[in-house]
């Protein structure tokens, strides 16, 4: 990018440049027309037939360097051959020279700084490319040449730029004075501003665009070099900031359309909200949960949301004495998630009708809650209690929801208690084919003891043929029909109103060996 | 403002010769095309031809060539248009014209006049 | 030489019109084309140059167009100071002026 500081190009005023010294023959300030064909202001000199070492010098007027360290000064001009002038002297030169003069204010005058090199700072001597030519008998013809030049290092507040001629017949078309600089540059959302470089190369941070962020690492920042060129170099630069994406070739961030969303800060675009959610606003980081659905706290924030799963199905119950199985089946709506799990809840009712919340005595395999599988095992029911169970799926967001839970029910009613089993069972009398049994009465919770039943079989027979049964209502019974000395295991269990009880530990008894010895009290 | 003043009105017989002056004053005068252009009484504009003062050579009009000669003298910043051999229908206005812009400060050099002489009535009579 | 014709060679007109003035040339001459303005007893005036670039100091009422061999001055609106006689000048190859149109009054 160039800045200018001067072009006569676009004067419309006179320039009234200073000339050096006052006498005929100097630089004159002339209409011309360039390219365009626009009327622009020109200083010509032509005085081919001067003494030698005589110059003629022209000097702009005092130019602010406005910060510049270089600046150009590029030269449109025109230049009489020498051969084509009839009337040239050997002083006929096809060359001028420039100069500049630092100063911190327009000090100069028409005779100060003194009209030579030193003070004044000599750029260069200028040469002509192409000479304007006339052949006798054709027309003149030549072609405009075009210098540009470089001053400095500046360093005071402004400066005037001199041409010198000596001997040349030349018109100074145009003179456009600039520096260089990096222009304002957008590059990976990262905004470099306008710099004027003061060295060969000038690091310049960079500050993100709006709505972007830094990325991780250095500082973004890049590097404006002397001919107004940023250098090609990677940048760490910066990323648009969540809810923003990048747009217009990585220049600037455009906030995400209503229904859309960006969870991070990075590379990548707006995404379209997941499912169940909505974002109604631009520039959306996240998109807010439809009502009745939910974001757990692990979730990503682009993940889909989800609601509560319904009640689990057809719960199914099978009692064996204080032992209930639960199964059933998962619910229809697992809620879009995964982790689903399940919980129990449990009322008891005594027979006489008082409920309350389940004792400690039940226990749950594998738990009453955080269930991964469809079933569960509940032990420690109590005889004559109706139980309800209440079976609820549950997933990550159910803690998030308000309202009741839902939950598929079951009624288990347990049978009332059996007396216990029969122990502590004694032989009062043995004969070589009968046995006299007496035990305690057990105590039955639910009512008297009805009856007993004796099995008893003979020790080393097995098999269900061997096994022989007796009912009594008394605590008391005598096996007849025995073998001589022989070794009988036999068990005991009672019957109440709630059924049998448990038979009792297996006793061991023996018949005598012969009558001789008659009955024969044993204590168990 | 540059000015050309011509030399005064001139009364010359049938086959002499005339001599115009013009003198530019104020500013450059080697690298703009003097022209010459002629008006008889009641008629349009004639171009009889032109010179670069610092080239030294002139171009002419095929009608007037051997005619007519132009100089120019840069020390005195005057040019000249010599006529010979007059006839009757050499009775005019002799005008002198300045081009817009030299040689050296125009791009496309058009060779429009916008700085005229007073002009100069020469009449061929005997 | 080139030839230079000019139409009309004269022409009636009243303030206010617009008043067109064409001039041909006899090969192409590209834009190399001024045209003039003169009044009795005085030098001509330059009023456009390079067939369309006007000249400092004259009004914008005034144009020029055309290329090649093909010309036209065109006065928008015509004002009491601007009868006289116009003249077009070719400069592509020495000069030739063209016959001239004058404009008078109505």
């Known amino acids: 990018l160039e800045e200018t500081l001067l072009n006569t190009k676009l004067e419309t005023a006179d320039l009234k440049w200073v000339t050096f010294p006052q006498v005929d023959g100097q630089w004159e300030e002339l209409s011309g027309l360039d390219e365009e064909q626009h009327s622009v202001r020109t200083y010509e000199v032509c005085d081919v037939q001067r003494a030698p070492g005589q110059a003629h010098w022209l000097r702009t007027g005092w130019v602010p360097r406005r910060g510049a360290v270089h600046v150009y000064a590029t030269l449109r001009f025109t230049m009489l051959e020498c051969l084509s002038l009839p009337r040239a002297g050997r002083s006929c030169k096809e060359t001028f020279t420039v100069f500049y003069y630092e100063s911190d204010a327009d000090t100069a005058t028409a005779l100060t700084p003194a009209w030579m090199e030193n003070p004044y700072i000599k750029v260069d001597t200028v040469a002509a490319e192409h000479l304007t030519r006339k052949r006798p008998g054709a027309e003149a013809t030549g072609k405009v040449n075009v210098k540009t030049l470089r001053l400095g290092p500046l360093s005071k507040a402004g400066f005037y730029l001199a041409f010198q001629d000596q001997g040349a017949c030349m018109a100074l078309l145009s003179l456009h004075l600039f520096y260089k600089k990096c222009a304002q540059l957008t590059v990976n959302l990262t905004r470099f501003p306008e710099t004027v470089p003061r060295e060969l190369v000038v690091p310049v941070a960079g500050s993100c665009v709006v709505d972007a962020v830094p990325a991780p690492g250095p500082s973004p920042s890049l590097y404006c070099r002397e001919d107004g060129q940023w250098a090609e170099q990677p940048v760490t630069g910066c990323s648009c900031a969540p809810g923003f994406e990048a747009a217009e070739g990585n220049t600037k961030c455009r906030a995400c359309a209503q229904g859309t969303f960006k969870p991070l800060s990075g590379e990548g675009s707006c995404q379209p909200c997941p499912a169940n959610s909505h974002s109604n606003t631009i520039g959306s980081a996240v998109c807010q949960c439809r009502v009745g659905y939910f974001r757990a706290r692990t979730d990503p924030r682009g993940a889909p949301c989800t609601t509560p799963p319904s009640a689990p199905r057809s719960v199914v119950s099978r009692l064996n004495g204080s032992s209930l199985h639960l199964e059933w089946s998962a619910p229809l709506e697992s809620g879009g998630r995964e982790d689903l799990t399940y919980a129990l809840r449990c009322r008891e009712c005594r027979p006489g009708g008082s409920c309350a919340p389940c004792g400690g005595d039940l226990t749950f395999d594998p738990g009453p809650r955080d269930l991964v599988e469809p079933w569960v095992v509940v032990r420690g029911l109590r005889p004559d209690f109706t139980y309800t169970f209440e079976v609820t799926a549950l997933n990550g967001v159910s803690s998030l929801a308000t309202g009741p839970v839902p939950f598929e029910p079951v009624n288990v009613t347990t049978d009332r208690e059996v007396p216990p089993a029969v122990s502590d069972i004694r032989v009062t009398r043995s004969s070589p084919s009968s046995l006299s049994l007496a035990w305690a009465v057990p105590r039955a919770p639910s009512g008297a003891v009805l009856d007993y039943e004796v099995k008893y079989h003979e020790k080393g027979a097995e098999g269900p043929s061997s096994v022989r049964f007796l009912k009594t209502s008394e605590n008391r019974a005598e096996l007849r029909g025995l073998k001589r000395g022989a070794s009988y295991l036999v068990q005991v269990r009672a019957r109440s109103e709630a059924g049998y009880g448990p038979f009792g530990q297996e006793h061991h008894s023996q018949t005598q060996l012969d009558e001789s010895e008659g009955w024969r009290e044993q204590l168990a | 403002q540059v000015q050309l003043v011509q030399s005064g009105a001139e009364v010359k017989k049938p086959g002499s010769s005339v001599k115009v002056s013009c003198k530019a004053s104020?500013?450059?005068?080697?690298?703009?095309?003097i022209s010459w252009v002629r008006q008889a009484p009641g008629q349009g504009l004639e171009w009889m031809g032109r010179?670069?003062?610092?080239?030294?050579?002139?171009n002419y009009a095929q009608k007037f060539q051997g005619r007519v000669t132009i100089t120019a003298d840069e020390s005195t910043s005057t040019a000249y248009m010599e006529l010979s051999s007059l006839r009757s229908e050499d009775t005019a206005v002799y005008y002198c014209?300045?081009?817009?812009?030299?040689?050296?400060?125009?791009?496309?050099?058009?060779?429009?006049?916008?700085?005229w002489g007073q002009g100069t009535l020469v009449t061929v009579s005997s | 030489d080139i030839q230079m014709t000019q139409s009309p060679s004269s022409l009636s007109a009243s303030v206010g019109d617009r008043v067109t003035i064409t001039c041909r040339a006899s090969?192409?001459?590209?834009?190399?084309l001024n045209w003039y303005q003169q009044k009795p007893g005085k030098a001509p005036k330059l009023l456009i140059y390079?067939?369309?670039i006007l000249q400092s100091g004259v009004p914008s009422r005034f144009s020029g167009s055309g290329s090649g061999t093909d010309f036209t001055l065109t006065i928008s609106s015509l004002q009491p100071e601007d009868f006289a006689t116009y003249y077009c000048?070719?400069?592509?190859?020495?000069?030739?002026f063209g016959q001239g149109t004058k404009v008078e009054i109505k």
């Open positions: 014209a300045r081009s817009s812009y030299t040689i050296l400060t125009t791009y496309y050099n058009y060779n429009a006049m916008d700085n």
């Open positions: 104020g500013g450059t005068f080697s690298t703009y095309a």
């Open positions: 010179i670069i003062p610092i080239f030294g050579t002139a």
């Open positions: 090969q192409n001459i590209n834009n190399f």
């Open positions: 390079g067939s369309s």
């Open positions: 000048q070719q400069t592509h190859s020495q000069s030739t």
